[in-house]
Amino acid sequence: LEVQVPEDPVVALVGTDATLRCSFSPEPGFSLAQLNLIWQLTDTKQLVHSFTEGRDQGSAYANRTALFLDLLAQGNASLRLQRVRVADEGSFTCFVSIRDFGSAAVSLQVAAPYSKPSMTLEPNKDLRPGDTVTITCSSYRGYPEAEVFWQDGQGAPLTGNVTTSQMANEQGLFDVHSVLRVVLGANGTYSCLVRNPVLQQDAHGSITITPQRSPTGAVEVQVPEDPVVALVGTDATLRCSFSPEPGFSLAQLNLIWQLTDTKQLVHSFTEGRDQGSAYANRTALFLDLLAQGNASLRLQRVRVADEGSFTCFVSIRDFGSAAVSLQVAAPYSKPSMTLEPNKDLRPGDTVTITCSSYRGYPEAEVFWQDGQGAPLTGNVTTSQMANEQGLFDVHSVLRVVLGANGTYSCLVRNPVLQQDAHGSVTITGQPMTFPPEA
């Protein structure tokens, strides 16, 4: 017996009624006395509703189900589920037995639209450019869990420093609270979009913040134009300075360092004191120099992952910012050279020479030369693999046909440090073994 149900889930809003469609094709002469119809939960096999022995046996599911009794004889075995709840979500199986037997499962997807988000700002008074604020976007009583997106006033995504929590109430509906921590610019619009992924329904809220500005003009913040190059494992100073006015005191200063791209907080000095490192406890300010306008940041034990742009925000009465780039580097080790085969070599043999250099950053440039300084470009394969720290091991393989004798040298260059590491191997004309025996 062929039983037909919709392929796609039935989407029902919480509190409304849903129809789980199910149909079969009755043969001529069919009567309801022959019909056994059972609806049950697919997973638990819990009985939901049945029609047997020629009559409706009623709902076994919280008295919220009904059949379309006047349509049953035409093969309509659909089930009406009233006042849908989140707990109803799942798969329902429709079993139809006349002389023969068939079944099919239909999915119920429950949904509830999210409310228009309410936006709150903390702190919400006396805001100045450079202040760090917390913007909370709250939307209520939706289902299923929401997707939350933040944007600035130009449509650019704000992904750094967002924390989103979703809590279900007793009915299983979610309240979503998304918190954005952001450093205020001269003015800005921050918008939050809460999407119900099932209903493809968007609810959005936005807040425009216009901090107070003093008439004195922006603070000029100065940073080096060129990237700061720092060796892995050493300490780096990201220089940043401003010109304090006469009578300036540290109580007036808001200094914030953050990652330029993600807006992640790195270090801050506010309310007259050092608020400490928010970046793996590896940053420090030059506190004794702050009052003279030195807002530089010390980054300790530099890692590859630190590479990128850092923004220095300075707010006194007014506000200024500038970004400084950190370029991380690590020197490559002196290359080790291996030869394959390495025994009984003769002119005309094809050999593979491997040049390996370790733990450098960024990726190396590799050059091969013969004994006369001429480049060897054919048949060179270079691979560079990063380890867990992001440092590269470089392996460059040269396939070459031996001449009467020859020197093959490999140069591994660090393009940032302009540091060259080289190794070479000399192969003489008579039969030989590599490395030469003592």
């Epitope: 997106f149 944007q151 449509g155 995504p157 610019g185 939050c192 999407r195 936005s206 791209d261």
Partner: antibody
Framework: QVQLQQSAAELARPGASVKMSCKAS????????IHWVKQRPGQGLEWIGY????????DYNQKFKDETTLTADRSSSTAYMQLISLTSEDSAVYYC??????????????WGAGTTVTVSS | QIVLTQSPAILSASPGEKVTMTCRAS?????MNWYQQKPGSSPKPWIY???NLASGVPARFSVSVSGTSHSLTISRVEAEDAATYYC?????????FGAGTKLELK
């Protein structure tokens, strides 16, 4: 009407630099960000980055960050893109486009005609 | 980064036919935009904020969404629809485009 007028085609040698312009008219230049998009011959669209002419803030696709500089001159309502250390991979049409709309829905509503850059020795 | 995968790369259709092209995002996006580009011309805004038709776009164009897949449908293709269609997102950096679907007319 709203327009973005881009500078003429550029022919450059490998290793050289080019600076192209995008002049906005018909709207308030500082109200919208200007984005730059690359299209190599017969290929798709790649986002390079954008500049906010009001704050002069920029954001770059990491892929293009090292060889691209975006600037804007508010007095002439013109955005600029400089490409340095050119290679043959930089031969392409470069479009400027305005990112417009209203919160939270934005899109490129106006595009320049494109500047063709050819890198050849 | 969010990768947008457009399929098919090339779509061939006869005038009057119904066609569908898909743009699948590697993760959820806040909204999707679509652009039409004809050879030798700049891209034109076609559909913005997932399903809104840009000014001058015929009503035969529509978009449906299922999960992270966005499908652009032309109910009855006309000769003027021959072009490459690109999807675009900016829910997270970097802003990305799909590789495009080229609609050719038979």
């Amino acid at each position: 009407q709203v327009q973005l007028q881009q500078s003429a085609a550029e022919l450059a040698r490998p290793g050289a630099s080019v600076k192209m312009s995008c002049k906005a008219s018909g709207y308030s230049f500082t109200s919208y960000t200007i984005h730059w998009v690359k299209q190599r011959p017969g290929q798709g669209l790649e986002w390079i980055g954008y500049i906010n002419p009001n704050s002069r803030n920029t954001d770059y696709n990491q892929k293009f960050k090292d060889e691209t500089t975006l600037t804007a001159d508010r007095s002439s309502s013109t955005a600029y893109m400089q490409l340095i250390s050119l290679t043959s991979e930089d031969s392409a049409v470069y479009y400027c486009a305005r990112y417009s709309g209203s919160t939270p829905y934005w899109y490129f509503d106006v595009w320049g005609a494109g500047t063709t850059v050819t890198v050849s020795s | 980064q969010i990768v947008l995968t457009q399929s098919p790369a090339i779509l061939s259709a006869s005038p009057g036919e119904k066609v569908t092209m898909t743009c699948r995002a590697s993760s959820s996006v806040s909204y999707m935009n679509w652009y039409q580009q004809k050879p030798g011309s700049s891209p034109k805004p076609w559909i913005y904020a997932t399903s809104n038709l840009a000014s001058g776009v015929p009503a035969r164009f529509s978009v449906s969404v299922s999960g992270t897949s966005h499908s652009l449908t032309i109910s009855r293709v006309e000769a003027e629809d021959a072009a490459t269609y690109y999807c675009q997102q900016w829910s997270s950096n970097p802003l990305t485009f799909g590789a495009g679907t080229k609609l050719e007319l038979k």
